[in-house]
Amino acid sequence: ESALITQQDLAPQQRAAPQQKRSSPSEGLCPPGHHISEDGRDCISCKYGQDYSTHWNDLLFCLRCTRCDSGEVELSPCTTTRNTVCQCEEGTFREEDSPEMCRKCRTGCPRGMVKVGDCTPWSDIECVHKESGTKHSGEVPAVEETVTSSPGTPASPCSLSG
């Protein structure tokens, strides 16, 4: 319904940079690594290392690449079709319910519990009761046993956008 600005209408600094390749949309959609132009006639490539798009889309703008926080390591860089993959540093993990930050893994299990799972970038150490074998998901106890954990080996990346 609304007409859109053409590239000619844009100020020089707003025009697509020469390296931004163009192609025509297919049924109104642009391929991954591109966004649609204001007039809907062109697909404009995202800027490598700056923004990206992962799916066929009719987005006016590519999505900004995630920047890994301090306390995270970059497993793979942002490309025009895939966001940066960040992972918590050794000895820290990211919980599903608080994905904004990496938290320190506990160094050991509470008394009466044994460690059955190592610290990984996506989970704290896992403790179970010696007798019952039930898991413990509580906070760091006031008193810990001398059983300590070594940071786990990364198995799969944890990707977070924004």
Partner: nanobody
Framework: QVQLVQSGGGLAQAGGSLRLSCVAS????????MGWFRQAPGKEREFVAA????????YHADSVKGRFTISRDNAKDSVYLQMTKLKPEDTADYYC?????????????????WGQGTQVTVSS
């Protein structure tokens, strides 16, 4: 969570100007594209303008092209809508929104957040 607080609406004469502001807090402002929408009484919401995360790409609807300008100041976590040559048909409640991007039809992509709205009345 992102909080968006709007200001700058009010009453203007036809042919006059107004500037709307929207200040964001709560998350990294530069991760988001920003948009302005409006809704007149008894009408559907209309996509007015949008700007990408870096501020180097903008969209303006045909109905406001040449009269309204969207801009952003990432240092101030703010987005603006400069409205000039106002017409009575610009009378509406104006809302700012943040999203990862916006579709050509004005659909926000990804997590999106909205301002509280500000009223703009243009008298003839």
């Amino acid at each position: 969570q992102v909080q968006l607080v709007q200001s700058g609406g009010g009453l203007a004469q036809a042919g006059g100007s107004l500037r709307l502001s929207c200040v964001a807090s709560g998350r990294t402002f530069t991760n988001y594209a920003m948009g302005w929408f409006r809704q007149a009484p008894g009408k559907e919401r209309e996509f007015v303008a949008a700007i990408n995360w870096s501020g180097d790409s903008t969209y303006h609807a045909d109905s406001v092209k040449g009269r309204f300008t969207i801009s952003r100041d990432n240092a101030k976590d703010s987005v603006y809508l400069q409205m000039t040559k106002l017409k009575p048909e610009d009378t509406a409640d104006y809302y700012c929104a943040s999203a990862e991007s916006f579709s050509r039809g004005g659909l926000p992509y990804g997590m999106n957040y909205w301002g509280q709205g500000t009223q703009v009345t243009v008298s003839s």
